[in-house]
C-alpha cells in the first residue's frame, strides 16, 4: 500500500476519505485504527456500525467520527477539532472475523494554523500552502507519497 | 537507528551566503516534518524554520523571514537551509531536528549540529 | 508570542535527590508543553513531550506535570548522568524554548 497524506489545519476538522471495492468489500464492517510509529501494530480508533446495514450511520469515539457508504464503496473519516496530536499514521480497514484488510493507508499531518498567530511576532510564518486557501471550511488535502519516498532499512 | 548528520556549516563574512544540509537515514523522512533549531555559543536553543511533510508549507522565525529559506528532498532524504545576508547574530550551532510523524509541532530527534560563524 | 521563564537558572543537588524544575508561561500553553535535556557538547534530547507523556528509552524517574501556565520537570531520585540543563518548551503558539535550568552537582 501506498500511503497517502491528508493535511489539517490544528483546531479545525479534517475529512479522511478511503475509497474501496464495494461487491469485494460488501457485508463487511469498517475500522479505523492509528498505528504506532511507523512499524508498531495498529491501535482501533472507531469502528463502523455493528449491524452492517446501518453503517451510513456516523459513530463517534471522541472527536473521531467514522461512516461508510457501502454501495459507493468510500469510508470516511472525520477528525474533529485537530490537535497536533492527532498527526501520525492511520489505517482504514475492512474486518471478517477476527482479520482486517487494510483499505489505505492515511498519513494525518497537523499545520498550524496561520490566524491563530497572525498577532504573535517570533512564529509561524506560512510559506506557499495550498492548504490555507479557506481558513474556516472543512477541507482535507491529500497525495500519494512518490516513488523515491519508499521507507529505506535502518543503517547499522 | 535514526540518525541526522548536518554539514555546511563554517565561517562566513556578514552579508554573504551558507547553505545547510541534513542527511537523514533510519527513518522514512517524508513521513516526517522537520526543522532547523540553532544555539549561539554559551546560550539557550532558538527554534529558525520548520518544514512540512512534502515541503509545501514553510514557517520561519521572524528574524530570518526573508533571509532564510528551508526546503527538503525527500527523494534524497535530505534538509536545507540557505541562509542569505547573514548577520553576526546569526553565530551559531544550527540544529537539525526531527519532528514527529506528520507534524513539526516538537522534536523527536536532533543531529549533532553545524557551527555556523558570521564573522568580518 | 508566549515567552517561557524557567526556574532557578542553577540548581545544585545531590545523587538521590528528588529535584524540581519549574517553567513557567507568559500565557496559557493547553498542555503542549515538551522538556528537552542538553548535556555540554551534545544535541537535545526530548525526555517529555505533551505535559506529561515520557517519550520512548527515558527512564521513568523523569516526569513532567503542570496546566495552564505552569509547569513541573521532576526527577524522582536524581542519577549523575542527568546533570545537565533542561529546557521547557512550548508549541501551543509556535515554537518557544525556555533559558533553561542548569543542573550540578552539590
Known amino acids: 500500500h501506498n500511503t497517502t497524506v491528508f493535511q489539517g489545519v490544528a483546531g479545525q476538522s479534517l475529512q479522511v476519505s478511503c475509497p474501496y471495492d464495494s461487491m469485494k468489500h460488501w457485508g463487511r464492517r469498517k475500522a479505523w485504527c492509528r498505528q504506532l510509529g511507523e512499524k508498531g501494530p495498529c491501535q482501533r480508533v472507531v469502528s463502523t456500525h455493528n449491524l452492517w446495514l446501518l453503517s451510513f450511520l456516523r459513530r463517534w469515539n471522541g472527536s473521531t467520527a467514522i461512516t461508510d457508504d457501502t454501495l459507493g464503496g468510500t469510508l470516511t473519516i472525520t477528525l474533529r477539532n485537530l490537535q497536533p496530536h492527532d498527526a501520525g499514521l492511520y489505517q482504514c480497514q475492512s474486518l471478517h472475523g477476527s482479520e482486517a484488510d487494510t483499505l489505505r493507508k492515511v498519513l494525518v499531518e497537523v499545520l498550524a494554523d496561520p490566524l491563530d498567530h497572525r498577532d504573535a511576532g517570533d512564529l509561524w510564518f506560512p510559506g506557499e500552502s495550498e492548504s490555507f486557501e479557506d481558513a474556516h471550511v472543512e477541507h482535507s488535502i491529500s497525495r500519494s507519497l512518490l516513488e523515491g519516498e519508499i521507507p529505506f532499512p535502518p543503517t547499522s | 537507528e535514526v540518525q541526522l548528520v548536518e554539514s555546511g556549516g563554517g565561517l562566513v563574512q556578514p552579508g554573504r551566503s551558507l547553505k545547510l544540509s541534513c542527511a537523514a537515514s533510519g527513518f522514512t523522512f517524508s513521513y516526517y516534518g522537520m526543522a532547523w533549531v540553532r544555539q549561539a555559543p554559551t546560550k539557550g536553543l532558538e527554534w529558525v524554520a520548520s518544514i512540512s511533510t512534502g515541503g509545501g508549507n514553510t514557517y520561519y522565525r521572524d528574524s530570518v523571514k526573508g533571509r532564510f529559506t528551508i526546503s527538503r528532498d525527500n527523494a534524497k532524504n535530505t534538509l536545507y537551509l540557505q541562509m542569505d545576508s547573514l548577520r553576526s547574530e546569526d553565530t551559531a550551532t544550527y540544529y537539525c531536528a526531527r519532528g514527529d510523524i506528520g507534524t513539526t509541532y516538537w522534536f523527536t530527534y536532533w543531529g549533532q549540529g553545524t557551527l555556523v560563524t558570521v564573522s568580518s | 508570542n508566549i515567552q517561557l521563564t524557567q526556574s532557578p537558572s542553577l540548581l545544585s543537588a545531590s545523587v538521590g535527590d528528588r529535584v524540581t524544575l519549574s517553567c513557567k508561561g507568559s500565557q496559557n500553553i493547553n498542555n503542549y508543553l515538551a522538556w528537552y535535556q542538553q548535556k555540554l557538547g551534545e544535541a537535545p534530547k526530548l525526555l517529555i513531550y505533551?505535559?506529561?507523556s515520557l517519550q520512548t528509552g527515558i527512564p521513568s524517574r523523569f516526569s513532567g506535570s503542570g496546566s495552564g501556565t505552569d509547569y513541573t520537570l521532576t526527577i524522582s531520585s536524581l542519577h549523575s548522568e542527568d546533570l545537565a540543563t533542561y529546557y521547557c518548551?512550548?508549541?501551543?503558539?509556535?515554537?518557544?524554548f525556555g533559558g533553561g535550568t542548569k543542573l550540578e552537582l552539590k
Open positions: 518548551y512550548q508549541y501551543n503558539n509556535g515554537w518557544t
Open positions: 505533551k505535559t506529561n
